[in-house]
């Protein structure tokens, strides 16, 4: 399944164990933690990646939201329950029987409750806003060059169909990448915008999930684009349900 046969590795997911134990000695790769076999020709789901990474440290901070319904992942890392397809289960619970509902990118979208909490469906995150600040450069980047380079990155590195990159905005030093993907637009085999955003997030932090590739080397017309701060905002098809006086949604910020 496009795991490299010669040395039996998974090009798109280093958080796997690969073994020549498929039929006829074929290489097959399983995600750490869950044991689910992964397709190494495409991105692995964020849920399986988080499960593999559950021992990583928590990182949290709170900042202003661009929209009252936007979510950011403030709860940091947790060991998620994934369904057989590798998607987040709508309800997540911790070891102490505290439960909450999540969206399709695994971000909490309700107050925490107990085991009686019901999460009827997995609500899709259909709009992701990636907010970046780049390090100072001699001058501003050319907007159309920047736009083209980021679209190329998402198409080639993350295999995200170009139609899901809705816009690239730029006001030096802030870059915003908008990803949009409704349930009806996502065809079988399409990379999920949540997975692409997570791979990008890890790349920007210098924690690439790709096997053996160098880290992210973003250049616009030869000029290095170095990201010093990343914020990712998630908008769901159905607004989140927090109690009235909640002012800070969860936030997973990446300071880099």
């Amino acid at each position: 399944h496009t795991a490299a046969q010669d040395n039996c590795t998974c090009p798109t997911n280093k958080m796997t164990v690969c073994s020549p134990d498929g039929p006829g000695g074929r290489c097959q790769c399983r995600a750490l933690g869950s044991g689910v076999a992964v397709d190494c020709s495409t991105l692995t789901s964020k849920c399986l990646l988080l499960k593999a990474r559950m021992s990583a440290p928590k990182n949290a901070r709170t900042l202003v939201r661009p929209n009252e319904h936007a979510l950011v992942d403030n709860d940091g890392l947790y060991d998620p329950d994934c369904d057989p397809e590798g998607r987040f289960k709508a309800r997540q619970c911790n070891q102490t029987s505290v439960c909450w509902c999540v969206n399709s990118v695994g971000v909490r979208r309700t107050d925490k409750g107990d085991l009686s909490l019901r999460c009827d469906e997995l609500v899709r995150t259909h709009h992701i806003l990636i907010d970046l600040r780049h390090r100072p450069t001699a001058g501003a980047f050319n907007h159309s060059d920047l736009d083209a380079e980021l679209r190329r990155l998402f198409r080639e590195r993350y295999r995200l169909h170009p139609k899901f990159v809705a816009a690239v905005h730029y006001e030096q030093p802030t870059i915003q990448i908008e990803l949009r993907q409704n349930t009806s637009q996502k065809a079988a085999g399409d990379v999920d915008i949540g997975d692409a955003a997570y791979y990008f997030e890890r790349d920007v932090k210098g924690e690439s999930l790709f096997q053996g590739r160098g880290g992210l080397d973003l250049r616009v017309r030869g000029e290095p684009l170095q990201v010093e701060r990343t914020l990712i905002y998630y908008l769901d098809e159905i607004p989140p349900k927090f109690s009235m006086k909640r002012h800070h949604h969860h936030h997973h910020h990446h300071h880099h």
């Epitope: 399944h1 039996c8 164990v17 073994s19 020549p20 134990d21 498929g22 039929p23 006829g24 000695g25 074929r26 097959q28 750490l32 933690g33 869950s34 044991g35 689910v36 076999a37 992964v38 397709d39 495409t42 057989p84 397809e85 590798g86 079988a188």
Partner: antibody, heavy 115, light 111 residues
Framework: QVQLQQSGPELVRPGTSVKMSCKAA????????IGWVKQRPGHGLEWIGN????????NYNENFKGKATLTADTFSSTAYMQLNSLTSADSAIYYC????????WGQGTTLTVSS | VMTQSPSSLTVTAGEKVTLSCKCS????????????LTWYQQKPGQPPKMLIY???IREPGVPDRFTGSGSGTDFTLTINNVQAEDLAVYYC?????????FGSGTKLEIK
């Protein structure tokens, strides 16, 4: 050819521990998962857990966490399973197996827990 | 949960036998497009022997009268022209995700 040779039968007292071995030969030990399976008459087969000797990755069935400890020694190409706080319910045949296609199994180690 | 049926059956040599294994969740991996189901044969006093991997791939050396089929949650092991040496307990096991689990087995007896 691939072989998994398990240690001999064990007769032990309740409350004690036992460590059984599974020596692999005929393949690269560090490249394949080794699984452990329990078989009790009338209880069928139960997957205890597995270990990947190439990176010491270990997974346990929740039912055996705290009961079983899996380890591996890459120098001797041997996998081990320790069972602690033994009771009569632990009396069974324990198999090691190379997981994946062409699954090879050891001959089994019979454990009897009796006072 | 892996449910096997029947729990036992007795057949005459030469007959065709169909063993069933049902799983409470789909074993079809949408990424790899494989069904992570294995069939084992265990003869008295022996360890289990793998017959079928990925639901339908016969292991080398396994007679072609053994055929695995099915997808998702429902799987079948068919034994054509049953022989006296096929007397055994047959187990299915999934290796879709941890913990890998086995069915309770089907005991095949020959008249």
């Amino acid at each position: 050819q691939v072989q998994l040779q398990q240690s001999g039968p064990e007769l032990v007292r309740p409350g004690t521990s036992v460590k059984m071995s599974c020596k692999a030969a005929g393949y690269t030990f560090t490249k394949f998962w080794i699984g452990w399976v329990k078989q009790r008459p009338g209880h069928g087969l139960e997957w205890i857990g597995n270990i990947y000797p190439g990176g010491a990755y270990i997974n346990y069935n929740e039912n055996f966490k705290g009961k079983a400890t899996l380890t591996a020694d890459t120098f001797s190409s041997t996998a081990y399973m320790q069972l602690n706080s033994l009771t009569s319910a632990d009396s069974a045949i324990y198999y090691c197996a190379r997981e994946g296609s062409s699954g090879y199994w050891g001959q089994g180690t019979t454990l009897t827990v009796s006072s | 949960v892996m449910t096997q049926s029947p729990s036992s059956l007795t057949v005459t040599a030469g007959e065709k036998v169909t063993l069933s294994c049902k799983c409470s969740q789909s074993l079809l991996n949408s990424g790899t497009q494989e069904n992570y189901l294995t069939w084992y044969q265990q003869k008295p006093g022996q360890p289990p022997k793998m017959l079928i991997y990925w639901a339908s791939i016969r292991e080398p050396g396994v007679p072609d009268r053994f055929t695995g089929s099915g997808s998702g949650t429902d799987f079948t092991l068919t034994i054509n022209n049953v022989q006296a040496e096929d007397l055994a307990v047959y187990y299915c096991q999934h290796d879709y995700s941890y913990p890998f689990t086995f069915g309770s087995g089907t005991k095949l007896e020959i008249k």
